[in-house]
Interface confidence: low
Amino acid sequence: MSNSVPLLCFWSLCYCFAAGSPVPFGPEGRLEDKLHKPKATQTEVKPSVRFNLRTSKDPEHEGCYLSVGHSQPLEDCSFNMTAKTFFIIHGWTMSGIFENWLHKLVSALHTREKDANVVVVDWLPLAHQLYTDAVNNTRVVGHSIARMLDWLQEKDDFSLGNVHLIGYSLGAHVAGYAGNFVKGTVGRITGLDPAGPMFEGADIHKRLSPDDADFVDVLHTYTRSFGLSIGIQMPVGHIDIYPNGGDFQPGCGLNDVLGSIAYGTITEVVKCEHERAVHLFVDSLVNQDKPSFAFQCTDSNRFKKGICLSCRKNRCNSIGYNAKKMRNKRNSKMYLKTRAGMPFRVYHYQMKIHVFSYKNMGEIEPTFYVTLYGTNADSQTLPLEIVERIEQNATNTFLVYTEEDLGDLLKIQLTWEGASQSWYNLWKEFRSYLSQPRNPGRELNIRRIRVKSGETQRKLTFCTEDPENTSISPGRELWFRKCRDGWRMKNETSPTVELP
């Protein structure tokens, strides 16, 4: 076994571990003894935690530093005791300085909640350490925030219910500790891609959990089921939202990143995906009129199939700042698709296609595309992702989404891609042809497509334009129009009505 000690460094995390030995994080092999016990030397760093009340949107304003027991800065800096109070908690840092997402979040909060107090929790001296040491400091920082909140509670008119802790990465777990240690219950904690390593599978009191606030909502944007998951995979709030499945974020691929920065690296991809949670939250603050909705689902695969677009029984919610409080739920996983940039909102559609007969399908799954035509706009050509396989004499469900609001749907064009796109598919096609030489014509029969809009909860049925022609084969298309009796709307609540 090698004795070398590779250093694994991502934008957001740095670890050292002996090759071949278990990595010191994750459900097994956690550093239980060392974890969350602050080192004496680290708590001596002065000042270790500072509270910067942002008195302006402008980052050049130094704001005011609040400290427990000193009331003068509260008066000097017009701290509003009756208003909402936001505490923004950064995460682990390699640079030792504040990053630009913080400026955007402060500015967005000031824009949205003009009278609110926005406090930046500066724990840079304790966060600018080896990741494992920074993790060990989270408890100390949580205690400091709780002490500040306990002191503020002694003031007239200050209510813990008006407090909203917003923690990014490691800062989300700091928020959890603060919520756990404070006397009383804070109104809300938002976890923005809470850190995964050393917290995945951890005990409820050693990570962010639903017990830490009256309402805990979480955005997961960098989870990986293989390799290193920088964001925590497990649900840790009342509602846990996984945009784009919680893993690969649009606009963050290596090609996207290489195109937009001078020196694109895998590090930039990690930063882009991990930080996406912050930008989704900022989007929810500044683009109030374009709310993104997430839908409850047991897993990402079922969501990709289009099964989970219901708003019944609080199964859908706005994401980010506008999320509706759902205390009756715990660890409720919710999913949505997003655009690659602000505004992130997309329009989700469930498409139910009943295949009533199917000839010579061969080994490979067909590749289908749909184009949706609406009263406001027409969609681009959208792929129908086949999660498992096309079932015959069964209803096949798909998820499609558009970046623009199409309005009311009028017609649908379904296209079966003709030419195979890879050598592997060509080979499979060829094998299929050899095994079925007498009957090579592949064909599917579809009479109708049922469509449900996630955003409006409307259901529509589309029938083939020509009732006699229901077959589709490779390289061909089939047109569907609203059936005469097809305008159906079930008694389901539209999520747009559910905005707080």
Partner: antibody, heavy 119, light 106 residues
Framework: EVQLQQSGPELLKPGASVKISCKAS????????MHWVKQSHGKSLEWIGS????????SYNEKFKDKATLTVDKSSNTAYMEFRSLTSEDCAVYYC????????????WGQGTTLTVSS | ENVLTQSPAIMSASLGEKVTMSCRAS?????MYWYQQKSDASPKLWIY???NLAPGVPDRFSGSGSGNSYSLTISSMEGEDAATYYC?????????FGGGTKLEIK
């Protein structure tokens, strides 16, 4: 090592425009705001404005709003200040200075660019 | 704008002498910042957040004050301290500097 390297001295005629550069090295350019400060001969310092290289947001002193334009080129880690409609009042040394958002001070300064306006 | 008035404009002190210079703001500020500038050189950050010494600044320097009134003190003047000192505020835009106090050796 953090360094802010400014372009050389400029001698220009009244009415002309000039673009002074400030090349940053030794740190992540986009994570600090860049400010510009004027110092007339034998006089004090005057804040001109600032630019956040990450997203290009600018903030100006009203006095210089119609005089200066701040830009950045992220690919070369360089900040620029363009001064237009030059007069003898613009004769001064111009400094770029790095500022850490929310940290609150100019921790590194360029060496200064001397601008002389003379007919 | 917030006008910062430094006094005295020029002062001289003997080696080993205690030196105090002041900075008054026309409007209250949260913190004061001080920069040292020697002839033909760029200003250097000297004191930040009213009383914190920048890296490399000797501990004979100190800063204090609140509201409208701030001061910089040298407990025992040394030759290398001869320079011009500027105060500055970041509380409100435009961010203003004082006129400077030129400290010379007597």
């Amino acid at each position: 090592e953090v360094q802010l390297q400014q372009s050389g001295p400029e001698l220009l005629k009244p009415g002309a425009s000039v673009k002074i550069s400030c090349k940053a090295s030794g740190y992540t350019f986009t994570e600090y705001t860049m400010h510009w400060v004027k110092q007339s001969h034998g006089k004090s310092l005057e804040w001109i404005g600032s630019i956040n290289p990450y997203y290009g947001g600018t903030s100006y002193n009203e006095k210089f709003k119609d005089k200066a334009t701040l830009t950045v080129d992220k690919s070369s880690n360089t900040a620029y200040m363009e001064f237009r409609s030059l007069t003898s009042e613009d004769c001064a040394v111009y400094y770029c200075a790095r500022y850490g958002n929310y940290v609150g001070y100019f921790d590194y300064w360029g060496q200064g660019t001397t601008l002389t306006v003379s007919s | 704008e917030n006008v910062l008035t430094q006094s005295p404009a020029i002062m001289s002190a003997s080696l080993g002498e205690k030196v105090t210079m002041s900075c008054r703001a026309s409007s209250s500020v949260h913190y004061m910042y001080w920069y040292q500038q020697k002839s033909d050189a760029s200003p250097k950050l000297w004191i930040y957040y009213t009383s914190n010494l920048a890296p490399g600044v000797p501990d004979r320097f100190s800063g204090s004050g609140s509201g409208n009134s701030y001061s910089l003190t040298i407990s025992s003047m040394e030759g290398e301290d001869a320079a011009t000192y500027y105060c500055q505020q970041f509380t409100s835009s435009p961010y203003t500097f004082g006129g400077g106090t030129k400290l010379e050796i007597k």
